[in-house]
Interface confidence: low
Amino acid sequence: AITEAREEAKPYPLFPGPFPGSLQTDHTPLLSLPHASGYQPALMFSPTQPGRPHTGNVAIPQVTSVESKPLPPLAFKHTVGHIILSEHKGVKFNCSISVPNIYQDTTISWWKDGKELLGAHHAITQFYPDDEVTAIIASFSITSVQRSDNGSYICKMKINNEEIVSDPIYIEVQGLPHFTKQPESMNVTRNTAFNLTCQAVGPPEPVNIFWVQNSSRVNEQPEKSPSVLTVPGLTEMAVFSCEAHNDKGLTVSKGVQINIKAIPSPPTEVSIRNSTAHSILISWVPGFDGYSPFRNCSIQVKEADPLSNGSVMIFNTSALPHLYQIKQLQALANYSIGVSCMNEIGWSAVSPWILASTTEGAPSVAPLNVTVFLNESSDNVDIRWMKPPTKQQDGELVGYRISHVWQSAGISKELLEEVGQNGSRARISVQVHNATCTVRIAAVTRGGVGPFSDPVKIFIPAHGWVDYAPSSTPAPGNADPVLII
């Protein structure tokens, strides 16, 4: 039977009676061997109780005394079987054994749940020698018990290659409930059921759970731990916690906020990072996500021109990295740009609209009617063209770029000339005789260089040849420009 000593009980006397061999309780020990120093608590439990010797694990000595009397079996005396106490209290328990003096070097070790207790435990072994036997008392104390001290403690003694094991002493540390699982913060869809879990353990058991929502108890009757609260749905944010009750009192879990998922707030601080003729790079600061991760964003672009048809271009992009390059825009145009982002609930409102402009574009059309002819007397090539039709968005024409490539046997070199905006003709020096000159012209604005015209070729003869008629770009539909001599 388990002897149970509760902390409310008066401690037993340390030694209820003399040990065999007339060892008196007032004997001072001959030798005291502390395993570690430490506070010895006032709270003690009987190390020995009257009764028969333990017979479960005994050593039968083979040695006999001079008179050849057989020695009695060795066994630890019975002790308290079960100690129940509160967390942070002190406890001391012990085991005792009487060993004939013929045995030398007897040591007692303490074991907990099958593992030897080594190191800085408050264990003291005291020896009380008498004429024939030595009473050995091994005490074990814990100054402030914790849950981890729960377990089964035993003493072991090795004699004559035999191991003697005491009855177990069960230590049960009781305290307030301890949470092994607390409710977690969640983001939930409005009016949709969800579960919260709360689990707490003793000892002492049972542990009963009450759920609390916004400081009010949810369940009138407690539930045994573990408890799952099914909340059928919320319409507004709530704070849940659980109370764990046992005989020692109550522990309250952390309060967790259950947020209601909502559509996000609109993005803020939409700004222009870079602008070109046909694209605008924007960035934005996302608004509050409505307790649900952003999935993607939509960039809405409207022409700001009052004469435009008011149509909206929509560009979808991922929510990260809060950056998007809007492409396929017209040059030199004004746009209103807004950003909206969505989560699983829906789309946010559009951000405040911002105005943005594209820059001038490069010309979209090459100069027309390019004509090239050789002026042999001046050793120049004259080039003429017509100004291309420019759209307003292409910006202001600042000039032309002329590419002329000279090719003869083993030689090929390209040269570039810039001509002012009002020009429609140019003259370039002959670079190589007995060679072909290929000319292309492009219009230039601040937005860049437009497309080059189709190439026009002219043959430059060796010195002393007659003038040649001009070469010109072909009419639409012809294949290559024709060199006219």
Partner: antibody, heavy 125, light 112 residues
Framework: EVQLQQSGPELVKPGASVKISCKTS????????MHWVKQSHGKSLEWLGG????????SYNQRFQGRATLTVDKSSSTAYMELRSLTSDDSAVYYC??????????????????WGQGTTLTVSS | DVVMTQSSLTLSVTIGQPASISCKSS???????????LNWLLQRPGQSPKRLIY???KLDSGVPDRFTGSGSGTDFTLKISRVEAEDLGVYYC?????????FGGGTKLEIK
């Protein structure tokens, strides 16, 4: 004796809103959920939604989600059902009915043990 | 949603004779807690509904014992051993197992 006393008949125009009340007595109001059931003329019953007066949790039939709002006034032990954007399809008798003990809005249960006398709603221009 | 089907729209009976009303659900009403939340209501003419039976067969207080409920899974029956005049009205079955709670179309009990 448990009693659920509902407000009188309503005649409203399409697009408008209506708020029906259900005053309870004879039991502890905050210990039971309160539900609303619609019965169209000559037709069966349809659960509209439920409300837990203790913790202000609501639950709706998907068909009425967004248009119906259930509220309570604990001090007077009265439940309310507001229905918005009314159409002629909303013309029906609406009943309040008592549900199970505490926070069982979505849990299986033996609801609807006591019923109000019904409020007739007519939506007509 | 679970569909509750009451095959008979009208049942004509003679006073003192037995009556039987059937109700079928589109899925089993046996809950994981081992209970079957099938309930019966009676709506007398011009009145609000009144619960007669819950959990398939349990009679509400004040309901005469001539009413019995039976069935399991998806098939359920309400029986009246001897119909009395006060039993006339529309009988509805409804389920409280699967959210949202749904009602049968009703069976009208009338005098032959």
């Amino acid at each position: 004796e448990v009693q659920l006393q509902q407000s009188g008949p309503e005649l409203v125009k399409p697009g408008a809103s209506v708020k029906i009340s259900c005053k309870t007595s004879g039991y502890t109001f905050t210990e039971y959920t309160m539900h609303w059931v619609k019965q169209s003329h000559g037709k069966s019953l349809e659960w509209l939604g439920g409300f837990n007066p203790n913790n202000v949790i609501t639950s709706y039939n998907q068909r009425f989600q967004g248009r119906a709002t259930l509220t309570v006034d604990k001090s007077s032990s009265t439940a309310y059902m507001e229905l918005r954007s009314l159409t002629s399809d909303d013309s029906a008798v609406y009943y309040c009915t008592r549900g199970d003990l505490l926070w069982s809005l979505l849990l299986p249960g033996n609801y609807f043990d006591y019923w109000g006398q019904g409020t007739t709603l007519t939506v007509s221009s | 949603d679970v569909v509750m089907t009451q095959s008979s729209l009208t049942l004509s009976v003679t006073i003192g004779q037995p009556a039987s009303i059937s109700c079928k659900s589109s899925q089993s009403l046996l809950d994981s807690d081992g209970k079957t939340y099938l309930n019966w209501l009676l709506q007398r003419p011009g009145q609000s509904p009144k619960r007669l039976i819950y959990l398939v067969s349990k009679l509400d207080s004040g309901v005469p014992d001539r009413f019995t409920g039976s069935g399991s899974g998806t098939d359920f029956t309400l029986k009246i051993s001897r119909v009395e005049a006060e039993d006339l009205g529309v009988y509805y079955c409804w389920q409280g197992t699967h959210f949202p709670w749904t009602f049968g179309g009703g069976t009208k009990l009338e005098i032959k």
